[in-house]
Interface confidence: medium
Amino acid sequence: LECYSCVQKADDGCSPHRMKTVKCGPGVDVCTEAVGAVETIHGQFSVAVRGCGSGIPGKNDRGLDLHGLLAFFQLQQCSEDRCNAKLNLTLRGLNPAGNESAYEPNGAECYSCVGLSREKCQGSMPPVVNCYNASGRVYKGCFDGNVTLTAANVTVSLPVRGCVQDETCTRDGVTGPGFTLSGSCCQGPRCNADLRNKTYFSPRIPPLVLLPPPTTAAPSTRAQNSSSTTSTAAPTTTTSIIKPTTAQASHTSPHEMDLEVIQEEGASLSGGAAGHGGTAGHGGAAGHQDRSNMEKYPGKGGAQIPAKGGS
């Protein structure tokens, strides 16, 4: 089996002129392509992998929401030679957001890493952005985390920082098959320089207060982080947008809430060859669109192309 091979870390790693083909090893009977897109209110980026895969042919796509950070995951596996160039590997509408000046800053200030490498997203190196409220949602918290995509024996990971709705979340995450967006939230100007070591705290659990030694031993209270739940596979012919049914006023993990699944019929992942800037295009700058419009995510047609790197 011959497959396209490439790795894209928010760059042009899967651009047309950088497309490579690889011969798969014995026993490998599927080509795979996976794309994970992340959108903050200040822009969006995607990571992608193409190569020789494992498993069975099929499609899976899913929309996820982590405290106002939107993610979209797509996986496509196929069994014909060079069949893994059907997904649009970049986003079509928001990078960069463009008309942010039309929004009124709400006073919060965060570091922003949208498609930046780990080297450029260290400590206080990344750009600082003013948060604003969008689509009736309040973005006053800051987020520090990572998006990770694993496919074709390759793992791609990029940092994610920006404005979010929650100000206290700790090690929260949303997942798809081989895809994870996770991190922590904080409150205060530029507080998201490094939240890797943030410990769990929930306002519903009283903080630990040191008291004089009691005469009898008190039972200990331990906060449990329940962000490790893995979502189940979405139907292969629908786009599932998973979002909380209520505003996230509480600080629970998204997995602890009732979830509403909206299915868009006919969200086929296949499309004509549109290439690196063809009909569907490789994604890029345009005006900031309504955050509730999930159509801006990739994959409604338009093949994107593979390239250098890979498995």
């Epitope: 047309p16 690889v22 079509r92 800037g277 063809g278 994604g283």
Partner: antibody
């Protein structure tokens, strides 16, 4: 219909500067990787520079690195090439080309840049 | 000197089959990068003829075909016609130069 229209070429002395423009229409310019490719008189094609859809990824050929700057204005559907410290060997027809279908699938008609004293 | 090597000229009579070669190295064609072919008719801009080694954009006759093996590629034109008289260029990505590279071009002459 996809159209790419270059402008800004002309006669310039060595060491001088020129700014080429490429007006795009008939496709979503903000979603397209774009390149400049040049062709010296009677010679072959030479890739000059390449810019991603958002402008965040840029490459240059070694022959123009440090002298030429590629940029784009997606609100105006326009690609630019700022050429400084021009040399006689930069004399060529400059084409802007769209990356699509895994290659340069559309080309402009070209604009001639002549560097001579 | 071009990174990809093509014969400077080729010729054939109408109806004949002509093949144009394109030889690269381990940093471009040999690295697995796909090859594209462009046709440039006299006095006009280049036009994409073959992409992804052997695929034709819509509107390109099936008389044109491409292939790739190892560090080289070739363009075949069967049933040669007078309107095929043009310059033909191969192109591929090059790791060392970090950009697409072109062959020096082959001038195809249709005799008679």
């Amino acid at each position: 219909e996809v159209q790419l229209l270059e402008s800004g070429g002309g006669l310039v002395q060595p060491g001088g500067s020129l700014r080429l423009s490429c007006a795009a229409s008939g496709f979503t310019f903000s979603s397209a990787w774009m390149s400049w490719v040049r062709q010296a008189p009677g010679k072959g094609l030479e890739w000059v520079s390449y810019i991603s859809s958002s402008g965040s990824t840029i490459y240059y050929a070694d022959s123009v690195k440090g002298r030429f700057t590629i940029s784009r204005d997606n609100s105006k559907n326009t690609l630019y090439l700022q050429m400084n410290s021009l040399r006689a060997e930069d004399t060529a027809v400059y084409y802007c080309a769209r990356e699509g279908l895994w290659a340069f699938d559309y080309w402009g008609q070209g604009t001639l840049v002549t560097v001579t004293s | 000197q071009s990174v990809l090597t093509q014969p400077p000229s080729a010729s054939g009579t109408p109806g004949q089959r002509v093949t144009i070669s394109c030889t690269g190295s381990s940093s471009n064609i040999g690295a697995g990068y796909v090859v594209h072919w462009y046709q440039q008719l006299p006095g006009t801009a280049p036009k994409l003829l073959i992409y992804d080694n052997n695929k034709r954009p819509s509107g390109v006759p099936d008389r044109f075909s491409g292939s790739k093996s190892g560090t080289s590629a070739s363009l075949a034109i069967s049933g040669l016609r007078s309107e095929d008289e043009a310059d033909y260029y191969c192109a591929a990505w090059d790791d060392r130069l970090n950009g697409p590279v072109f062959g020096g071009g082959t001038k195809l002459t249709v005799l008679g």
